[in-house]
């Protein structure tokens, strides 16, 4: 079977409906909300996951930005339009014909406008900074152990190759994970950093997207790493276009 060997389920996405109606009676899974077929050997795109998660409450945040062009997902949940490959369409609109442009991780990168708003291309988020604060521990974690454990986690749980984990910074109690990935760097089968970051974010919040797998149990040399808060910053290949009004 394609999805799972014996019971027809999707290990990487519990927000799916699966049935053995694929070629040769193989298990095939479709994302809730969109009905699109998903590959259960890898992460489902963030766009399809957001579409399946329409009922979740808004989670608005305001953050101090690490650079003038960094974006934070302050708008919370919305029902996105996804393209046939499951990626965000560059222009998103709500039911009241308010439209805006988003980046490849679905975060708004322009002021809101009307139906005349043009978004020429989907701008790629090529750098993601995941900022974590961990709960107090007896002592600081060893930096190289922490680095190795996070690289292993991103490879084994999220299938992200370690080449895309650009750096792990640590100043107790703050951990920063830098993910970097240009369009040209992605080879066949490589997971998108935006999808990996989203799965990680949901894991940290105790809202795992994985089917039947336990929640995230992060340990460094046997010592539990418990996260108190997470901030995620997104940097696009082309800086966002907001009016000065928004910045004041």
């Amino acid at each position: 079977h394609t999805a799972a060997q014996d019971n027809c389920t999707c290990p990487t996405n519990k927000m799916t409906v699966c049935s053995p109606d694929g070629p040769g009676g193989r298990c095939q899974c479709r994302a809730l909300g969109s009905g699109m077929a998903v590959d259960c050997s890898t992460l489902t795109s963030k766009c399809l996951l957001l579409k399946a998660r329409m009922s979740a409450p808004k989670n608005a945040r305001t953050l101090v930005r690490p650079s003038e062009h960094a974006l934070v997902d302050n708008d919370g949940l919305y029902d996105p339009d996804c393209d046939p490959e499951g990626r965000f369409k560059a222009r998103q609109c709500n039911q009241t014909s308010v439209c805006w442009c988003v980046n490849s991780v679905g975060v708004r990168r322009t002021d809101k406008g009307d139906l005349s708003l043009r978004c020429d291309e989907l701008v790629r988020t090529h750098h993601i900074l995941i900022d974590l604060r961990h709960r107090p521990t007896a002592g600081a974690f060893n930096h190289s152990d922490l680095d190795a454990e996070l690289r292993r986690l991103f490879r084994e749980r999220y299938r992200l190759h370690p080449k895309f984990v650009a750096a792990v910074h640590y100043e107790q109690p703050t951990i920063q994970i830098e993910l970097r990935q240009n369009t040209s760097q992605k080879a066949a089968g490589d997971v998108d950093i935006g999808d990996a970051a989203y799965y990680f974010e949901r894991d940290i919040k105790g809202e795992s997207l994985f089917q039947g797998r336990g929640g995230l149990d992060l340990r460094v040399r046997g010592e539990p790493l418990q996260v108190e808060r997470t901030l995620i910053y997104y940097l696009d290949e082309i800086p966002p276009k907001f009016s000065m009004k928004r910045l004041t």
Epitope: Q5, P11, S41, R155, K163, S184, A187, A188, G189
Partner: antibody, heavy 119, light 108 residues
């Protein structure tokens, strides 16, 4: 169709270096990982390292302790594997293989290059 | 590194037989297990990836199953061209990616 064509057999002396080439055709060279795997006579398969041709990123099997270097030339769609400080136990057939980023399966292989290390 | 152990290391069978080769990983590798066939003097060929997915052009008599640490390659009805050596390989962990030691399938 996808093809990986490797350079010919080599005979080297202990302590020398060897550089094996692998020319890819039939697909976009920069869109797939390239791996190198070796097989000593009558033995199993041993993964040596990988490269992403688009940006030249490499990672290696630590067993080779800096003796292996993988490079690529995108203008000719060719990958190279250089092994230095050769010893007799490096006598093997060396293969390049195209890889998938998620499954890490090697779906197409070169024909192999026999490297013999002998004094 | 993750160790991969195949069994048996060799086996004899006849054309038409159903044959099973097993592969065990030293730790959970989810479904990231691939199978290859190699004939003498030739490069390996991918048969099955991600435990059970058939590579293009591979006959349907080959199938794979398993999850976690225990995996199986099954040939439902042996054909003369199937006599070869079979290797499993894990693609789950950080590099290095590791292979089983091989199972030689011979004509009885």
């Amino acid at each position: 169709q996808v093809q990986l064509v490797q350079s010919g057999a080599e005979v080297k002396k202990p302590g020398a270096s060897v550089k094996v080439s692998c020319k890819a055709s039939g697909y976009t060279f920069t869109s797939y990982w390239m791996h190198w795997v070796r097989q000593a006579p009558g033995q199993g398969l041993e993964w040596m390292g990988e490269i992403t041709p688009s940006d030249g990123y490499t990672s290696y099997n630590q067993k080779f302790k800096g003796r292996v270097t993988i490079t690529r030339d995108t203008s000719t769609s060719t990958a190279y594997m250089e092994l230095s400080s050769l010893r007799s136990e490096d006598t093997a057939v060396y293969y390049c293989a195209r890889g998938h980023g998620n499954y890490v399966s090697f779906d197409y292989w070169g024909q192999g290059t026999l490297v013999t290390v002998s004094s | 590194d993750i160790q991969m152990t195949q069994s048996p290391s060799s086996l004899s069978a006849s054309v038409g037989d159903r044959v099973t080769i097993t592969c065990r990983a030293s730790q959970d590798i989810s479904n990231y297990l691939n199978w290859y066939q190699q004939k003498p003097g030739k490069a390996p060929k991918l048969l099955i990836y991600y435990t059970s997915r058939l590579h293009s052009g591979v006959p349907s008599r080959f199938s794979g199953s398993g999850s976690g640490t225990d995996f199986t390659l099954t040939i439902s009805s042996l054909q003369p061209e199937d006599f070869a050596t079979y290797f499993c390989q894990q693609g789950y962990s950080l590099p290095p990616y590791t292979f089983g030691q091989g199972t030689k399938l011979e004509i009885k």
